[in-house]
Interface confidence: medium
């Protein structure tokens, strides 16, 4: 019995269906096929869980969190024992193993390993202004998303015809900050932060209103 080399890893957006491949070749009839799918969750590597089991011509549920979401992609028994996971969750990320036995066929590699990464688009970031908006002050525009896998990068732009930040601005796309020094009336306006990763983007807006000192009455 020989389990085929798997492609290594599968990436899927949260909520979508993941297909985890596993196929084998055997010299024996599929009368005593036994397939166990296990997962070593990324969030808890010390606690492997059973995903689904095929034994004695019957399918059995694994861990409670997979109930109703997991099945074999084809009619069993078969030499393709790939599974699907519906409505993928962040907690499904991990290393999946298919263990195949088909007596009396012995020997060879009977384990296939596939990594699953569940990707999450950035949630709408939260925009914040730090510092006084008085003329001549320094302000920091802050932007961060609570969710996003891979970790989002952040691009700030001033929503005018140029989409460019003021010349006195410095941007950190990893931290999601923009520092604007010595703000002037030209600094006023709408600023948009775009949080993006491999599978999505989302935005937030800031309305920077530079406050000019009121002329004093004599």
């Amino acid at each position: 019995l020989e389990v085929s080399e798997s492609p290594g890893s599968v990436q899927v957006a949260r909520g979508q269906t993941a297909v985890l491949p596993c196929a084998f070749s055997t010299s024996a009839a599929l009368l005593n096929l036994n397939v166990i799918w296990m997962v070593i969750p990324l969030s808890n590597a010390n606690q492997p869980e059973q995903v689904i089991l095929y034994q004695g011509g019957q399918m059995f549920d694994g861990a409670l969190r997979f109930h109703g979401r997991v099945g074999f992609t084809g009619t069993m028994p078969a030499t393709n024992v790939s599974i699907f996971i519906n409505n993928t969750q962040l907690s499904d990320t991990g290393t999946y193993q298919c263990l195949v036995n088909n007596l009396p066929d012995r020997g060879g590699r009977n384990i296939g390993v596939t990594g699953l990464t569940v990707l999450v688009p950035p949630s709408a970031p939260q925009c914040q202004i730090q510092g006084s908006q008085d003329l001549g002050s320094d302000v920091i525009l802050l932007c961060s998303s609570e969710e996003g896998i891979p970790r989002p990068t952040y691009l700030w732009e001033k929503l005018d015809n140029t989409l460019k930040l003021p010349p006195t601005a410095t941007q950190d796309q990893v931290q999601g900050t923009v520092t604007i020094r010595n703000i002037s009336a030209l600094s006023s306006g709408l600023y948009q932060c775009v949080a993006s990763n491999a599978i999505g983007t989302s935005t937030c807006l800031l309305d920077l209103q530079v406050i000019s000192p009121q002329p004093r009455s004599v």
Epitope: A124, Q126, C127, L159, D160, S188, S202, C204, L205, D207
Partner: antibody, heavy 126, light 107 residues
Framework: EVQLLESGGGLVQPGGSLRLSCAAS????????MSWVRQAPGKGLEWVSA????????YYADSVKGRFTISRDNSKNTLYLQMNSLRAEDTAVYYC???????????????????WGQGTLVTVSS | DIQMTQSPSSLSASVGDRVTITCRAS??????LNWYQQKPGKAPKLLIY???SLQSGVPSRFSGSGSGTDFTLTISSLQPEDFATYYC?????????FGQGTKVEIK
């Protein structure tokens, strides 16, 4: 009392022009960004254009870009919307609205239209 | 553009009823969501900002909830003056967009 009062609406032929005004009172006008929002008869609300407090930055919906111009005169506490090349689909009640910023406990900024004018009707018809 | 979809588009209810209106955004907008009430021939009025914060002067029977893409406006006990059209509106990205409105009518 905080108030916005639009004027300048009326009947105009397709291809014509109109200038709407919005007079603000009861607040420091120059400290607030402002928007125009319109509502076609029997329809929902549609954001049209916005302008920063200083007047230095302007924003438009795609449906009016290149035809409408938003501006303000902070010395007169007045917001304007110059509408050119008017079309039948521009027929609507036009409202001016103030942008208010609301801070949250976590420190981030949210905005809403907290004060609206009573609206002025623009009818584009031949 | 961020699309805002309200449901239902209209509903009939009686005074004292609990009414729920939902609003769904086409992408995550965090809590950048406002609710407005509009009566015939009048300008819209801000009810709820930041998804769940009650605007000053608005009765406490109005409440908002939700975050991300799904939001709800609830009127705990409908009063005669609450018969109106309600709009949600996002402030996460330009263009600023509104839902199509939900008309609350007397049963």
């Amino acid at each position: 009392e905080v108030q916005l009062l639009e004027s300048g609406g009326g009947l105009v032929q397709p291809g014509g022009s109109l200038r709407l005004s919005c007079a603000a009172s009861g607040f420091t006008f120059s400290s607030y960004a402002m928007s125009w929002v319109r509502q076609a008869p029997g329809k929902g609300l549609e954001w049209v254009s916005a302008i920063s407090g200083s007047g230095g930055s302007t924003y438009y919906a795609d449906s009016v870009k290149g035809r409408f111009t938003i501006s303000r005169d902070n010395s007169k506490n007045t917001l304007y919307l110059q509408m050119n090349s008017l079309r039948a689909e521009d027929t609507a009640v036009y409202y001016c609205a103030r942008h208010e910023v609301f801070g949250t406990s976590s420190g981030y900024h949210l905005y809403a239209f907290d004060i609206w004018g009573q609206g002025t009707l623009v009818t584009v018809s031949s | 553009d961020i699309q805002m979809t309200q449901s239902p588009s209209s509903l009939s209810a009686s005074v004292g009823d609990r009414v729920t209106i939902t609003c769904r955004a086409s992408q995550s907008i965090s809590s950048y969501l406002n609710w407005y009430q509009q009566k015939p021939g009048k300008a819209p009025k801000l009810l709820i900002y930041a998804a769940s914060s009650l605007q000053s002067g608005v009765p406490s029977r109005f409440s908002g909830s939700g975050s991300g893409t799904d939001f709800t406006l609830t009127i705990s006990s409908l009063q005669p003056e609450d018969f109106a059209t309600y709009y949600c509106q996002q402030w996460s990205g330009l263009p600023l967009t509104f839902g199509q409105g939900t008309k609350v009518e007397i049963k």
